[in-house]
Interface confidence: low
């Protein structure tokens, strides 16, 4: 069965950092790209940015830039997000979610990781 | 940044009433090469990831009944719900792919 | 990884065609775009065109349009560029590349930059 | 079609010196869209850098790009042997065009 499991919720303090893991299994991860969106509470879902699976190349919004890392190990299925530098209004529900080129919709998202930022 | 714009931010229908949502882009997301808009809309209810209802413009993913459909082309699209159900109650996206991803702002459906 | 394999080089006459082609392995074929760039010697590097194989349809730098044909055998993984009307200013190395630009509307993943390379091909135009 | 204009030709430098690079776009480019490359003599060409300043995998944190609008940099903050090749840079604009290249040689 196709799926992406995220990792849980985290609590941090401004300024801190968090890693999100997201774990594919049931279809092989090289053929697909992984992007990470995020939800704040009562806001619109926001693009953050993607990782190619295969090559690990990857692209974030600008906004973002420079304050997220997203990385891969294939051997364990996994992609990751990581954000810095965190602030309050980073406190937000990030999904995972597949892609595959020549497509380019979500047909498969994790559940969704509550990040809260409080001091 | 293609910057997506969805109308009404909420709708209020009755059970078995049709219900419709709009979407612009601001610019077009018709790929003349391949003949595909890439614009998707996914249904998302509280609590829940998003879930894809339509991609390319209108084509139903697989499982989701026949009473949503997706229309439009260029800049301009539409989803239409022709006989809301009560388990239609949700939030729906828009979301374009034609560069990056940029997400519409929701319009919530509730039930009149 | 993705590893690009070309044909061999190439002598031909003025006003022949060429047709190079570009095997690939170690990923999965219809999942990339596959762009055509060329070299001629002591030059610079020169896009010629590129193709989405999934969806079949090429398309061509200005400078080389009527001249190039791009396609791609899925069932192979394999990417062809056939140059026609040969002469001797073709003479160059020719090089596929992963990625292809974005006015595809590939959603952000071709942004113009190419990466693995194959080999090259030289193909030499000479009477 | 946008000219991108690759400056010095040449750069004479010693190992473990810094090498700046640039890069002049005949107009605006977005930053999304800008590439460099190394070549090696008799081997194609390598991606270092994608979307002006991230780095390809693989490629050692000496190399770095920067910049905007219609001026772009490569750095290399301590040259080792190995760095020592021709250095492109390259745009996505309607089509694709390369500058001229950098000849980065042993002083």
């Known amino acids: 069965q196709v799926q992406l499991v995220q990792s849980g919720a985290e609590v941090k303090k401004p300024g801190a950092s968090v890693k999100v893991s997201c774990k594919a299994s049931g279809f092989n991860i090289k053929d697909y790209y992984m992007h990470w969106v995020r939800q704040a509470p009562g806001q619109r879902l926001e693009w953050i940015g993607w990782i190619d699976l295969e090559n690990a190349n990857t692209v974030y919004d600008a906004k973002f830039q420079g304050r997220v890392t997203i990385t891969r190990d294939t051997s364990a299925s996994t992609a990751y997000m990581e954000l810095s530098s965190l602030r309050s209004e980073d406190t937000a529900v990030y999904y995972c979610a597949r892609d595959a080129y020549g497509r380019y919709f979500y047909d498969v998202w994790g559940q969704g990781t509550l990040v809260t930022v409080s001091s | 940044d293609i910057v997506m714009s969805q109308s009404p931010d909420s709708l209020a229908v009755s059970l078995g009433e049709r219900a419709t949502i709009n979407c612009k882009s601001s610019q077009s997301l018709l790929n003349a090469r391949t003949g595909k808009n890439y614009l998707a809309w996914y249904q998302q209810k509280p609590g829940q990831p998003p879930k894809l209802l339509i991609y390319w413009a209108s084509t139903r993913s697989s499982g989701v009944p026949d009473r949503f459909s997706g229309s439009g082309s260029g800049t301009d699209f539409t989803l239409t719900i022709s006989s809301l159900q009560a388990e239609d109650v949700a939030v729906y996206y828009c979301v374009q792919s034609y560069f990056r991803r940029t997400f519409g702002g929701g319009t919530k459906v509730e039930i009149k | 990884q993705v590893q690009l394999v070309q044909s061999g080089a190439e002598v031909k006459k003025p006003g022949s065609s060429v047709k190079v082609s570009c095997k690939a392995s170690?990923?999965?074929?219809?999942?990339?775009?596959i762009s055509w760039v060329r070299q001629a010697p002591g030059q610079g590097l020169e896009w010629m065109g590129g193709?989405?194989?999934?969806?079949?349809?090429?398309n061509y730098a200005q400078k080389f349009q009527g001249r190039v044909t791009i396609t791609a055998d899925e069932s192979t993984s394999t990417a062809y560029m056939e140059l026609s009307s040969l002469r001797s200013e073709d003479t160059a190395v020719y090089y596929c590349?992963?990625?292809?630009?974005?006015?595809?509307?590939?959603?952000?993943?071709?942004?113009?930059?190419?990466?693995?390379w194959g080999q090259g091909t030289l193909v030499t135009v000479s009477s | 079609e946008i000219v991108l204009t690759q400056s010095p030709g040449t750069l004479s430098l010693s190992p473990g010196e810094r090498a700046t690079l640039s890069c002049r776009a005949s107009?605006?480019?977005?930053?999304?869209?800008l590439a460099w490359y190394q070549q090696k003599p008799g081997q194609a060409p390598r991606l270092l850098i994608y979307?002006?300043?991230s780095r390809a995998t693989g490629i050692p944190d000496r190399f770095s790009g920067s910049g905007s609008g219609t001026d772009f940099t490569l750095t290399i903050s301590r040259l080792e042997p190995e760095d020592f090749a021709v250095y492109y840079c390259?745009?996505?604009?309607?089509?694709?065009?390369f500058g001229g290249g950098t000849k980065v040689e042993i002083k």
């Open positions: 590349a992963r990625g292809a630009p974005n006015y595809y509307g590939s959603g952000g993943y071709d942004d113009g930059w190419f990466d693995p």
């Open positions: 170690g990923g999965t074929f219809s999942s990339y775009a």
């Open positions: 193709i989405i194989p999934i969806f079949g349809t090429a």
């Open positions: 107009q605006s480019v977005s930053s999304s869209y």
């Open positions: 979307g002006a300043s």
């Open positions: 390259q745009q996505f604009g309607r089509d694709p065009t």
